[in-house]
């Protein structure tokens, strides 16, 4: 209620002869603050005095007169809150009833506090969970309700009296709730822990034993066992027996039920301590245990590999990769169930023995067409040698071979026929599906492998086919040496280099692009007229009159060919002049008179002069010289000049006579 | 029958490419599992192996020289080449280039050789 | 890789005597092993192939012989033009030749 002052503190404090006590304490006054202390050992009121009595432990007054015991005992409180105290050292008498009497001003207060001082230090306490489990973590708890400042002690855990390794967590408590020291130890015990003693170990600074709390564990496990075989090494051979014992060498609690498995399924009707196997067959080669149950579960013993040794059984053959790629690599693996392994491998490739092939493994680095087939291998060891089993198949793919374009026409091949060709290989695998041919063309494919080529062409020259699987293999290409007429027959001015005048060396060349077969023969013709049989045409003078259109012809063995026609142009000077004249060489005055130069000329004249019986020049320039009206005077000789590129020509002299008209006739 | 002839510039500069050509007659390097390599003697020395190209223009390399060596073929004019580059005084030797016929399995051996070329690295 | 290990480095005989020039494997070669004459100053020869095959045009005097790891090279008799220097090779090793057994006139 409010009239009481409110103190914490722990109820009893426990400690041990020449150790110390630490007392945490809180309080709170009624009113003001505390001005007397005094700590009682056992106080008793008395009723007389309305005093206590006891021995006075610890005195703090106004007047500041303090007890020797003053030195042992300290109050380390205040004047309105904390109220804690030491005793150091502490001693067996100091057992009983603290009393703290506190003052204030106007009010007074007996607080009571437990103190069991023991003679040696009493031991820690062992706390273990309810239940312990193999390899299941527990803590461990020592706890000893003492802490004090001026009296360090440590807790020290032990398995069989020699200490533990694991890491102990230790934490103290000196607080107004509770005074104690903890340690804790977390732990994972094994089944090889069950009955062991664990001690929890109080000791002092210095680590000298003061005492100790000890427990018995009690680890429950599956059962713990043991297997022995007969013969020790689990190794025999077909035919043999075998003796397998299982024993319990713990087992908490007690087991119940027993069996035995073989590569963990079990055996049935198997439930005795003992398993014998008579007349063993490879098939019972496997890891054997026993098995033991208790209430915390199933036991299993290690496992015994039995041997059941044997002769290779007929062998398989595993290919890594199969169908492979010219030029790849295969792996071969022989596999083949025997104990002990084999030790020893013959391999054969369709029936023969491959020679130096004496492990599981054959790798063939680059595969070869003719490494395709069948390939068995047989496998030893010390019971004997395996029988060769069925063997594998080695498919072996690559491109066709040996692609050949064969003609088959008869030869030579002309322009214009119609060519067969085929295309051949010598193998492949897989089978050929389709064929390729080079250059392409508008041919047709009457059946797989054959092309026809209609109207051959001249310039056909090389024909390459290529037969295709999942690969293409091209052959060589083949010519088709395709015969033809002359081709691109030409006449070509050899001399001279410029125009070709009259009287020139004049030069024709037969020309041809190509023929096939290569031996020719030549014709030159004019106007239809063999001219000659050489491949040139020679003029050592060219005159006008050889002038003209000229064609030469080129023939093989397959034909002939004409060349375009071609003009052969004479350039001269002009020639055969003559004056010819109109309406005749006698004209009546006062009429007209046309002159006409004429001339033969190329290229054609291109200025014309006229001269009169004087051999004076006139001055007309054109081919025709016109005189109207024409007079009397005009009587006389003319003659023209004709001049072109190439020259001038003259025309010998033509005598014109003008006579008198009958009028002018009249006059005279 | 099989001839193999090898042919090279006969002396180089250091740090310059070696180019070396094969030129062979009597087989083809078409023909499935047949090979050729090219092996080196160092005066005095014993035979080194270079390089090798089969028939399928798959090839092999000594592993020390892998990274200056190159080798090709031209079957249809039936030559194979070696390029080295960055040679250096050490690549002084007889050049020799050998053919290996298709095997029966995997056992590729030279059954006909080259006379040799010399090379020459001046530094 | 395998590595091949010629013995011995050189080898003195007198003529007429038999001599055996050995090649060890650090594995398994299945007989894929070839010996090689080589002349001084000439190209190397073909002697055996696949082990114990003779080469044609080999005189009989020359034998090889071996299996798995290892293999030799016998000559009886020598003769004076079976002098120069000997060399096992397998293809598949690295390096492909071994060191090489020079035989000198004793």
């Known amino acids: 209620d409010s009239s009481k002052w409110v103190f914490e503190h722990p109820e009893t404090l426990y400690a041990w002869e020449g150790a110390c006590v630490w007392i945490p304490c809180t309080y709170r006054a009624l009113d003001g603050d505390l001005e007397s202390f005094i700590l009682f050992h056992n106080p008793e009121y008395n009723k007389n005095t309305s005093k206590f009595d006891g021995t006075r432990l610890y005195e703090s007054t106004k007047d500041g007169k303090v007890p020797s015991e003053q030195k042992r005992v300290q109050f380390l409180g205040d004047k309105n809150k904390n109220c804690t105290l030491s005793i150091h050292p502490v001693h067996l008498n100091d057992s009983g009833q603290l009393g703290l009497r506190m003052e204030s001003k106007t009010e007074k207060w007996m607080e009571r506090i437990h103190l069991n001082v023991s003679e040696r230090p009493f031991p820690p306490h062992i706390q273990l969970p309810p239940e312990i489990q193999e390899s299941q973590e527990v803590t461990l708890t020592c706890l000893l309700n003492f802490s004090c400042y001026g009296y360090p002690i440590q807790l020290q855990w032990l398995l069989e009296g020699v200490p533990m390794r694991q890491a102990a967590v230790t934490s103290t408590s000196l607080t107004i709730k509770s005074v104690f020291t903890r340690s804790e130890l977390k732990f994972s015990p094994q089944w090889s822990h069950h009955g062991k003693i664990v001690t929890c170990q109080l000791q002092d600074a210095d680590g000298k034993f003061l005492s100790n709390d000890t427990v018995q564990l009690n680890v429950k496990h599956t059962p713990k066992l043991e297997i022995k075989v007969t013969p020790s090494d689990a190794i025999v051979r077909e035919g043999d027996s075998v003796t397998m014992t299982c024993e319990v060498s713990s087992s908490n609690p007690e087991y119940t039920t027993v069996s035995w498995l073989k590569d963990g399924t079990s055996l049935k009707k198997q439930n005795t301590f003992t398993l014998n196997l008579r007349e063993v067959t490879k098939d019972q080669s496997g890891k054997y245990c026993c098995q033991v149950s208790n209430d915390v579960g199933p036991g299993r013993s290690e496992e015994v590999f039995l041997q059941v040794q044997y002769a290779p059984e007929p062998s398989t053959v595993q290919i890594l990769h199969s169908p492979a790629v010219e030029g790849s690599q295969v792996e071969f693996l022989c596999m083949s169930l025997a104990n002990p392994l084999p030790t020893n491998y013959t391999w054969y490739h369709n029936g023969k023995e491959m020679q130096g092939r004496t492990e599981e493994k054959v790798h063939i680095p680059k595969i070869l067409p003719w490494h395709a087939g069948t390939y068995s291998c047989v496998a030893e060891n010390i019971l004997g040698t395996g029988q060769r089993g069925p063997g594998a198949e080695l498919d072996v793919q690559y491109p066709p071979k040996k692609v050949t374009t064969v003609i088959q026409n008869p030869m030579p091949i002309r322009e214009g026929d119609t060519v067969t060709l085929s295309c051949n290989y010598n193998s492949s695998n897989p089978s050929v599906t389709r064929y390729e041919w080079k250059p392409h063309g508008a041919w047709e494919e009457p059946s797989l492998g054959v092309l026809k080529i209609q109207n051959v062409g001249w310039d056909n020259t090389t024909i390459a086919c290529a037969a295709c699987n999942s690969w293409c293999s091209w052959a060589s290409p083949v010519a088709l040496n395709v015969q033809y007429a002359p081709r691109d027959v030409r006449v070509r001015k050899i001399k001279p280099l410029s125009e070709i005048h009259s009287g020139n060396s004049v030069s024709l060349q037969c020309d041809f692009s190509s023929s096939h077969p290569k031996e020719v023969q030549f014709f030159w013709e004019k106007n239809g007229r063999l001219l000659g049989k050489e491949s040139q045409l020679n003029f050592d003078s060219i005159s006008p009159e050889d002038a003209g259109s000229y064609s030469c012809w080129v023939n093989n063995s397959i034909g002939q060919t004409a060349s375009k026609a071609w003009t052969l142009e004479v350039l001269y000077a002009p020639r055969r002049l003559r004056v010819s004249m109109s309406p005749g060489d006698q004209v009546m005055e006062g009429k007209s008179a046309t002159l006409t130069c004429e001339s033969d000329a190329n290229p054609p004249v291109s200025h014309y002069t006229w001269f009169d019986w004087n051999n004076q020049s006139l001055p007309y320039h054109s081919q025709k010289l016109r005189l109207e009206p024409v007079k009397v005077q005009h009587s006389g000789a003319y003659w023209c000049q004709g001049t072109n590129s190439v020259g001038k020509g003259r025309s010998p002299l033509s005598t014109l006579t003008v006579y008198y008209s009958p009028e002018t006739i009249g006059r005279r | 029958q099989v001839t193999l002839k090898e042919s090279g510039p006969g002396i180089l500069q250091s740090s310059q490419t070696l180019s070396l050509t094969c030129s062979f007659s009597?087989?083809?390097?078409?023909?499935?599992?047949?090979?050729v390599s090219w092996i080196r003697q160092p005066s005095g020395k014993g035979l080194e192996w270079l390089a090798h190209i089969y028939w399928d223009d798959d090839k092999r390399y000594n592993p020390s020289l892998k990274s200056r060596l190159t080798i090709s073929k031209d079957t249809s004019r039936n030559q194979v080449f070696l390029k080295i580059t960055s040679v250096d005084t050490a690549d002084t030797a007889t050049y020799y280039c050998a053919r290996a016929p298709p095997p029966n399995w995997d056992e590729y051996y030279f059954d006909y050789w080259g006379q040799g070329t010399t090379l020459t690295v001046s530094s | 890789d395998i590595q091949m290990t010629q013995s011995p480095a050189s080898l003195s005989a007198s003529v007429g005597e038999t001599v055996t020039i050995t090649c060890r494997a650090s594995g398994n070669i299945h007989n894929s092993l070839a010996w090689y004459q080589q002349k001084q100053g000439k190209s190397p020869q073909l002697l055996v192939h696949n082990a114990k095959t003779l080469a044609d045009g080999v005189p009989s005097r020359f034998s090889g012989s071996g299996s798995g790891t290892q293999y030799s090279l016998k000559i009886n008799s020598l003769q004076p033009e079976d002098f120069g220097s000997y060399y096992c090779?397998?293809?598949?090793?690295?390096?492909?030749f071994g060191g090489g057994t020079k035989l000198e006139i004793k």
């Open positions: 009597g087989f083809s390097l078409s023909t499935s599992g047949m090979g």
């Open positions: 090779q397998h293809f598949w090793s690295t390096p492909p």
